[in-house]
Amino acid sequence: EDWQCPRTPYAASRDFDVKYVVPSFSAGGLVQAMVTYEGDRNESAVFVAIRNRLHVLGPDLKSVQSLATGPAGDPGCQTCAACGPGPHGPPGDTDTKVLVLDPALPALVSCGSSLQGRCFLHDLEPQGTAVHLAAPACLFSAHHNRPDDCPDCVASPLGTRVTVVEQGQASYFYVASSLDAAVAASFSPRSVSIRRLKADASGFAPGFVALSVLPKHLVSYSIEYVHSFHTGAFVYFLTVQPASVTDDPSALHTRLARLSATEPELGDYRELVLDCRFAPKRRRRGAPEGGQPYPVLRVAHSAPVGAQLATELSIAEGQEVLFGVFVTGKDGGPGVGPNSVVCAFPIDLLDTLIDEGVERCCESPVHPGLRRGLDFFQSPSFCPNPPGLEALSPNTSCRHFPLLVSSSFSRVDLFNGLLGPVQVTALYVTRLDNVTVAHMGTMDGRILQVELVRSLNYLLYVSNFSLGDSGQPVQRDVSRLGDHLLFASGDQVFQVPIQGPGCRHFLTCGRCLRAWHFMGCGWCGNMCGQQKECPGSWQQDHCP
């Protein structure tokens, strides 16, 4: 009988303790927000906000410019000065709550916790391949704003998410802010609003549309806005909030809110509950039917998917899918199953479910006792009636009022619990060739790059490495610049290639040559590496 090589166990064919050093930038303080810009003429930039400062970096993460955004009331505050001679409000540090690009101008918009949550607009000025910020414009007109009606009060100190959409000759800011009674009383930023940036950059147009948590619920009902994005005809917000206005406020769940990206109105505001579960292949005795619920969204990202995952999700390749990392509760502490699970929600399916929910509410025969919901935003009512009314009047449409869809969208963990003890804190999904890759940051400062695929009982790693020695959590927001992703951890920004940091963690030639084509791995004497690392022979075809 022929002698055969002993088979190397899969886990032994790789070493996740291999050190990779990726380019980084030390921001000088905890990174609060980060966004990237890629112009159509090869110019690009990374914008990094820390308390009281905004850094502009080149694509090589070298500093190009730095701007003082606080403290408010300090003569050195460069953004504050754009609002003219002060004082404009109580002195205090500026924590950046919003950092977004307005692609139509193009410009960077930053909004902070100070000065009533006002924003500043910085036109982008390309210089070669770098980008500079022009002098900021103060998006605040004092005579237009009052504590009870403040179009220019955008950011909440409790957190704000913004997505900018170009419509016509203006940029519309889709804004979602967490509120409590104190924040609502002082220049209330509203819960959800759509604000039109004025052409003269003096602020936002008055008379904007908005929804806000009703005063009686502000103390007990808090909404955390986790993520926002624009795709197709809609803007979406993802929230974590109490499952009920009346029950235990600590019983949380996740919702998707959908707003029209083509009409700056809130009549077609819709919410849908997202249900993510861990359903082990072999169910333990006493485990809940349908799997263990993971009701709290931690991070999310939407992306078009590659062919293989598309087939598994029964959708077409390239269709947009919302990916979310869910945990069992706010603390994300250990439960029976894994710490983190990942669920995939195809956008077209989400839209279909929402549209079906509208039909159920508005098309006769309406199921008796079907509630319009959203009682924290509007007066309770039953379908098809408008909020607070007993019946529809002839000139109103059931469809022109906000609605919570009566069914939820349920999915199970794509990774079948294989993330185990890992606590995922950041997520970005890319399509490489026909492969869909989840790039995840973790609570202990690591990056995991894993193929998103359902049908396996092990994880297909592109990489799993530590960003540095600090072990600080990777922050929620990830940005892409060219073929790199930017992750923030502590006071550092790290630049990670989307195709992985290298190949040295593959220990055997067989494993090396089975790596994905996009990684560019080959066998190099006695190690796995990319061609640029190999001065001698580099082999992608066969093992010695």
């Epitope: 139509a104 101008l105 016509g168 003269d200 005809a233 029209s260 083509t262 009409e263 109105e265």
Partner: antibody
Framework: QIQLQQSGPELVKPGTSVKISCKAS????????MNWVRQKPGQGLEWIGR????????RYNEKFRDKAILTVDTSSSTAYMQLSSLTSEDTAVYFC??????????????WGQGTSVTVSS | DIQMTQSPASQSASLGESVTITCLAS??????LAWYQQKPGKSPQLLIY???SLADGVPSRFSASGSGTKFSFKIDSLQSEDFVSYYC?????????FGGGTKLEIK
């Protein structure tokens, strides 16, 4: 009534530049965007870009970014478009047009009569 | 860029008849659509804004419908002055783009 009066026809040589004007009357120039549109002989309409006279902020169609420069002189209520490095491909009628809000929506509601630019050696 | 596909490129009709022109957007634009009329040697004139709303002074025989990606424009009871060119335009995202135009001719 509101009018946009454009400068007269131009016959120019290849490689040169031309600056055409559009004078607004009976409304405040700085309150509305001014757009420029090209129409080649026997063809359709192409949007070149727009300028907001209140701030001089411009937005160009990428196709025309290296061709057109939009400016305004608010003291004379006049908008200008300079076309550079002219070739026979730039032979066209150029229109200025105001865009305005109608409720939430926008439309180009007043147009100049057009300026014919012919590029020929 | 958003492509606007207008059809037909030309159409023959008789006085008093109705005609319909369609415009398809390559992506959803809500109701950010305008229709213009252009007479030979003249500048375009606004007829319809917000996909369905008639501009001031435009006769009621002109009408339009649609939202999202599919739009149509109708002229009832054609009169001699209507036999000119018509363009749709999306104003949702820059660059604002026009359809290729439709030339109406008398049969």
């Amino acid at each position: 009534q509101i009018q946009l009066q454009q400068s007269g026809p131009e016959l120019v040589k290849p490689g040169t530049s031309v600056k055409i004007s559009c004078k607004a009357s009976d409304y405040t120039l700085t309150d509305f965007y001014m757009n420029w549109v090209r129409q080649k002989p026997g063809q359709g309409l192409e949007w070149i870009g727009r300028i907001y006279p209140g701030t001089d902020k411009t937005r160009y169609n990428e196709k025309f970014r290296d061709k057109a420069i939009l400016t305004v002189d608010t003291s004379s209520s006049t908008a200008y478009m300079q076309l550079s490095s002219l070739t026979s491909e730039d032979t066209a009628v150029y229109f200025c047009a105001r865009s305005a809000y109608y409720g939430n929506y926008v439309a180009m509601d007043y147009w100049g009569q057009g300026t014919s630019v012919t590029v020929s050696s | 860029d958003i492509q606007m596909t207008q059809s037909p490129a030309s159409q023959s009709a008789s006085l008093g008849e109705s005609v319909t022109i369609t415009c398809l957007a390559s992506q959803t634009i809500g109701t950010w659509l305008a229709w213009y009329q252009q007479k030979p040697g003249k500048s375009p004139q606004l007829l319809i804004y917000a996909a369905t709303s008639l501009a001031d002074g435009v006769p009621s025989r002109f009408s339009a419908s649609g939202s999202g990606t599919k739009f149509s424009f109708k002229i009832d009871s054609l009169q001699s002055e209507d036999f000119v060119s018509y363009y749709c335009q999306q104003l949702y995202n820059t660059p604002w783009t026009f359809g290729g135009g439709t030339k109406l001719e008398i049969k």
